[in-house]
Interface confidence: medium
Amino acid sequence: MGNSCYNIVATLLLVLNFERTRSLQDPCSNCPAGTFCDNNRNQICSPCPPNSFSSAGGQRTCDICRQCKGVFRTRKECSSTSNAECDCTPGFHCLGAGCSMCEQDCKQGQELTKKGCKDCCFGTFNDQKRGICRPWTNCSLDGKSVLVNGTKERDVVCGPSPADLSPGASSVTPPAPAREPGHSPQIISFFLALTSTALLFLLFFLTLRFSVVKRGRKKLLYIFKQPFMRPVQTTQEEDGCSCRFPEEEEGGCEL
């Protein structure tokens, strides 16, 4: 026990002596952050001049503070021990390590391309002012149906699977453990809406049945085709869309 205690003391003395010798050999090692070892003044520690800093001790020079000019603005002022930090002026956002570049913001529903901000193409969205347009969630992959359609700015909202919603279908899937017994208010509301729609549709059909002779067959076919046509989103099909057809220069939509 006494022997190991002696060893520890001896080691400590050696380390302390080494540190003292090192500081005698290199007085600069004593200079703290925020100072530099001034060779012109007999190696004494001088504070960093204005607009410069040293973040570590023992430095022989201070570094010039970063300047946030142009599109950059100061996020954190330079101090004697730390560099200034910049971010970007409104309308731009940071890119690169330490915000080395500023990139233009776009609107939600757009993405920045080589040619500036362009609208997201059909089937994609961007809910931020930066980043790229991402494809809408494919609800069917999770066995769900689309409850709310997607837009350029928002993803689709997935709802219960179509099987869950057909009145006569008996579901084989057991209910989720967390769900309380009985139907949720949303499901009941949905069934009521569905029943009402079915009744209205039936009424509409019967009315049309009697008027078909007067109006002619073509009109009837047209009415029944209409609801199933894909809606044309004119706002996304103009030249401003970031997607191009394959034969055009930009290439297709990356989904």
């Epitope: 503070c65 300047q67 890119l95 570049m101 990139e103 920045l112 391309t113 080589k114 930009e250």
Partner: antibody
């Protein structure tokens, strides 16, 4: 015409330091950002660092951050790379290259690229 | 983030050489092409996908479609034999090079 000439390469032991220089001529040096790019034997080109035209703002690749320091002396038309705590993986040909942008601080997003390069100087880190 | 290039491409003199570079950010970011002849400094031959610096022969052209950028040398000549590197930045602003394609003009 634009000319960039690197010097200061050589064989050095791991943990030691080396300082590379790049002498520029044929253009107004103080108007341009400058880069160092390196190429290890049989490997891809790797961007190392950039210093803006005014010498104040500097950025580094993660692989060299804290060990390498880029600097410039506009009065001497010279770019420097101080390399400390060198590792075997720092062995490469080091090129200095001019940034294409006339004034980096004009305040718009830019994609850096290099319009003129030097011939390179070989740094070998070996024990 | 990576830019992927074929290691080598071979053509006969007078033929068209095509060198590709693929990267996920290329639909949004420009591609740049550098030529490096043995023992020499790299030379910029195409910038911003398809622009040619002054002094670069007209047979060099560039294009970009989707995630693929292409350097085309129409009527390749023996003196075009070199390593060709593509370069771009990724969506975070990091600077990235491809690993190069060795063009052989047989």
């Amino acid at each position: 015409q634009v000319q960039l000439v690197e010097s200061g390469g050589g064989v050095v032991q791991p943990g030691r330091s080396l300082r590379l220089s790049c002498a520029a001529s044929g253009f107004t040096f103080s108007n341009y950002g400058m880069h160092w790019v390196r190429q290890a034997p049989g490997k891809c080109l790797e961007w190392v660092a950039i210093i803006w035209y005014d010498g104040i703002n500097k950025y580094y690749a993660d692989s060299v951050k804290g060990r390498f320091t880029i600097s410039r002396d506009n009065s001497k038309n010279t770019l420097y790379l101080q390399m400390n705590s060198l590792k075997a993986e720092d062995t490469a040909v080091y090129y200095c290259a001019r940034d294409q942008d006339y004034d980096i601080l004009t305040g718009y997003y830019k994609e850096d690229y290099f319009d003129f390069w030097g011939q390179g100087t070989l740094v070998t880190v070996s024990s | 983030y990576e830019l992927t290039q074929p290691p080598s491409v071979s053509v006969s003199p007078g033929q068209t050489a095509r060198i590709t570079c693929s990267g996920d950010a290329l639909p949004k970011k420009y591609a740049y092409w550098y030529q490096q002849k043995s023992g020499q400094a790299p030379v910029l031959v195409i910038y911003e996908d398809s622009k040619r610096p002054s002094g670069i022969p007209e047979r060099f052209s560039g294009s970009s479609s989707g995630t693929m950028a292409t350097l085309t040398i129409s009527g390749a000549q023996v003196e075009d034999e070199a390593d060709y590197y593509c370069y771009s930045t990724d969506s975070s602003g990091n600077r990235v090079f491809g690993c190069g394609t060795k063009l052989t003009v047989l």
